[in-house]
Interface confidence: low
């Protein structure tokens, strides 16, 4: 038999500094958690420990912090290189900046194989990104040799940036041929390793033969066997064993996301490249792992350049800014709730007697939310900690909408509810009551909007045929998140301000911010 | 071989409206972000607008934002900027730029320009 | 806005020198910068992008170096089709900036 440890991590999204517990910045240094520098202590750790160890990132190393904002990707590259990955697979955030974005700071100089055998790029793009990235590696590791075939989730091009010369291909379709080649090279132990979310990698498990093992991403899924050792409750046992068509138990990782943990996991085959046995679970990667001091050094020297960002205070907030998943993707959030009345109160123009305001209705995916703000770090909030909040560098866009294609959106916000999809709605300016119990497509029972043709704003049922004008991300003005309806029928788009900027603007106005949830989003059940 | 070929220019009066066109051939053009760069007679280069190739990403300088905007129809490979308000600080050369995919990126291939003068 | 300064701002110079321009950003921008060189009349052409790439077609004696504020552009033996403008340009962030250039004239 023959033993490799599979060490790895996914959607670090850009937390190459240590966090607090809920991924937001560190606020209490003795209580943060993960980081690179203490990542690559608890690697090496592992590397001098145990024999044959593979460091692996199932994507989504790109988007989430000032890092990335600043750098642009080439952090990615640099600090990946210093903990020498041995591959990665491509998730979607790494198309943020369009292909170039990812070609130039990371495939360039990243000194690890980075991997997706379902993304093919066509026309121009084919010859320049030729070589840079590919759909499987073969590593040597110890005196055996292990195949590493690489995914991307096939919706990357309605979340990102790719362009229009990458074609993504369905996952299993794309894989299977490149696993069967990496047979015929007499490659007999495999790991999937990609970016398409936990029901996918079950799937790959299922239904591509000769696959090993499977590593994944996207869905920031939390697999652990035991009594989990922090707040993420485990979606299931770690690892998450799968029988595959062919009667082989596969067994199916992630690690949660944000570096916190470091997916450990024990792998023994056969002389034939059979799993004998799979075992480990994520390590928290809490204080009591100190940060590796080089690497901390490099980290610090890196910071100098993002310091003009981070230290100047916008406002205060005297409450606790939920801009978690768990709230934003399933519930009314009042970080939701503050960015829509900052993108409200940005848009006030009192250009005619008749209306208090030209607009007053505010759509906010939860997706788009994507960290919390601590309240207990002085109430001090930075442009950085907007950033982590608000990474995407969008704009906060003005459409005039039929009240009809309002209803299909927020119908559309909870046709998988439940899910931790990105499409849920957070509002401003809106009143509206989902009902779970009916079918997808006639969930909203109750929608109400806020008037303008008014001197006291007051709450109006929505009239489908009424024009609506509704302030919202440039992301689903272009149909982002699935709101192709937004797209399709929008009646006039005008593109408006940076994102972040229009939230610390507001907040520098108000100085002192304490947004509440106060039942713009309501559940019920029964009849109306 | 990338060929940008702007057109549009003249001579207009302060406050009034112009709109340039630049036709591109050679390449994809609903792969790139585009952009629009001026520059005054005897001085230097200033960043009008940018667009990403589709439409998602927008960006204007501060002196022309609100009074000019940049669109592209990438069935017809073309890239407008259509010019409200104009004022005399306005006249220069205005040249069409092949970016990269993603908008900030370095603009690789220029067209020859064409001129706006802004005269009453 | 990020200010791109170029200096110097004029130059004379023989065929066969060697000829350094600096441009210097108001604010870190990686390798997010790019040179243009640019003649009577003519657009500008695209010489090096992220700092120190070469754009294809443009030959070898032009190269730049520099990361965060501070960049050059070097040409290692200046010949007759090298008196021009010279231009850098940030794209780490909008609004996209050009520094204010630098002539190269013959001595």
């Known amino acids: 038999a023959w033993e490799l440890t599979i060490l790895h991590t996914n959607d670090v999204h850009s937390r190459l500094e240590q966090t607090s517990e809920d991924s937001s910045k560190c606020v209490n240094a003795s209580r943060c958690m993960g980081g690179v520098a203490r990542l690559f202590t608890k690697v090496q750790q592992i590397r001098r420990a145990e024999p044959n160890v593979l460091l692996l990132d199932a994507g989504d190393q790109y988007q989430g912090t000032i890092w990335f904002t600043v750098y642009k990707g080439a952090e990615v590259a640099h600090f990946m290189n210093a903990l020498r990955y041995d591959a990665m697979a491509l998730g979607n955030h790494e198309f943020d900046n369009g292909v170039e974005g990812l070609i130039e700071p990371l495939l360039k100089e990243a000194k690890f194989p980075i991997l997706s055998a379902n993304i093919k790029a066509k026309g121009p793009l084919a010859s320049q990104i030729s070589g840079l990235y590919l759909p499987y590696k073969v590593l040597p590791v110890g005196d055996e040799v292990v195949g590493i075939v690489g995914y991307t989730s096939k919706e990357t091009p309605f979340l990102s940036n790719p362009g229009t010369n990458l074609v993504f291909e369905d996952e299993i379709t794309a894989l299977q041929p490149e696993v069967d080649k990496l047979k015929t090279l007499n490659v007999n132990k495999i790991i999937a390793l990609g970016h398409s979310g936990f029901e996918m990698d079950k799937l790959i498990a299922q239904k591509v033969r000769g696959v090993d093992v499977v590593v994944g991403g996207h869905s920031n899924t939390f697999l652990y066997t035991g009594n989990p050792p922090s707040k993420e409750v485990p979606a299931g046992k770690y690892p998450f064993i799968v029988t595959s068509d062919d009667g082989r138990k596969v067994p199916v990782v992630q690690a949660y996301a944000f570096g916190k943990y470091l997916g450990y996991l024990k792998i023994e085959f056969d002389e034939r490249g059979n799993v004998i046995s799979s075992h480990g679970n994520p390590i928290l990667l809490n204080s009591s792992i100190p940060e590796d001091p080089s690497i901390k050094a490099d980290i610090n020297k890196w910071r100098i350049k993002l310091d003009n960002y981070s230290t100047q205070e916008l406002g205060k907030t005297i409450v606790y800014l939920d801009g978690s998943s768990q709230s934003c993707r399933f519930r009314e959030c009042n970080m939701g709730n503050l960015i829509c009345d900052a993108m409200i109160n940005n848009n006030l123009r009192h250009t005619d007697e008749m209306f208090w305001n030209h607009v007053s209705m505010c759509i906010l995916n939860g997706g788009g939310i994507r960290s919390p703000i601590d309240e207990r770090n002085n109430g001090t909030i930075t442009w950085e900690n907007l950033a982590a909040v608000l990474p995407f560098g969008g704009t906060f866009d003005l459409v005039q909408l039929k009240g009809s294609t309002l209803k299909k959106a927020f119908e559309h916000s909870v046709h998988r509810y439940g899910q931790s999809t990105g499409e849920f709605l957070q509002v401003g300016g809106i009143h509206v009551v989902y009902d779970l119990s009916r079918k997808p497509g006639d969930r909203v029972v109750k929608l109400d909007v806020l008037c303008t043709k008014c001197r006291v704003p007051s709450y109006d049922p929505l009239k489908m045929d009424e024009v609506y004008k509704v302030i919202l991300p440039n992301f689903l003005a272009n149909g982002g998140d699935g709101f192709q309806m937004i797209k399709d029928e929008l009646l006039r788009h005008d593109s408006g301000d940076q994102d972040i900027n229009v939230v610390s603007t507001y907040i520098s106005k108000m100085k002192v911010i304490y947004p509440a949830v106060e039942g713009r989003i309501k559940f019920s059940t029964g009849s109306h | 071989e990338v060929q940008l070929v702007e057109s549009g220019g003249g001579l207009v009066q302060p406050g009034r409206s112009l709109r340039l066109s630049c036709v591109a051939s050679?390449?994809?053009?609903?792969?790139?972000?585009m952009h629009w760069v001026r520059q005054a007679p005897g001085k230097g280069l200033e960043w009008v607008s940018g667009?990403?190739?589709?439409?998602?990403?927008?960006g204007y300088a501060d002196s022309v934002k609100g009074r000019f905007t940049i669109s592209r129809d990438n069935a017809k490979n073309s890239l407008y900027l259509q010019m409200n308000s104009l004022r005399a600080e306005d006249t220069a050369f205005y040249y069409c730029?092949?970016?990269?995919?993603?908008?900030?990126?370095?603009?690789?291939?220029w067209g020859q320009g064409t001129l706006v003068t802004v005269s009453s | 806005d990020i200010q791109m300064t170029q200096s110097p701002s004029s130059l004379s110079a023989s065929v066969g020198d060697r000829v350094t321009i600096t441009c210097r950003a108001s604010?870190?921008?990686?390798?997010?910068l790019a040179w243009f060189q640019q003649k009577p009349g003519k657009a500008p052409k695209s010489l090096i992008y992220?700092?120190?790439s070469l754009q294809s077609g443009v030959p070898s004696k032009f190269s730049g170096s520099g990361s965060g504020t501070d960049f050059t552009l070097t040409i290692s033996s200046l010949q007759p089709e090298d008196f021009a403008t010279y231009y850098c340009?940030?794209?780490?962030?909008?609004?996209?900036?050009f520094g204010g250039g630098t002539k190269v004239e013959i001595k």
């Open positions: 340009q940030q794209y780490n962030s909008y609004p996209l900036t």
């Open positions: 992220a700092a120190s």
């Open positions: 604010q870190g921008i990686s390798n997010y």
């Open positions: 667009i990403s190739w589709n439409s998602g990403s927008i």
């Open positions: 050679g390449f994809t053009f609903d792969d790139y972000a």
């Open positions: 730029a092949q970016g990269g995919y993603a908008i900030l990126t370095a603009l690789e291939y």
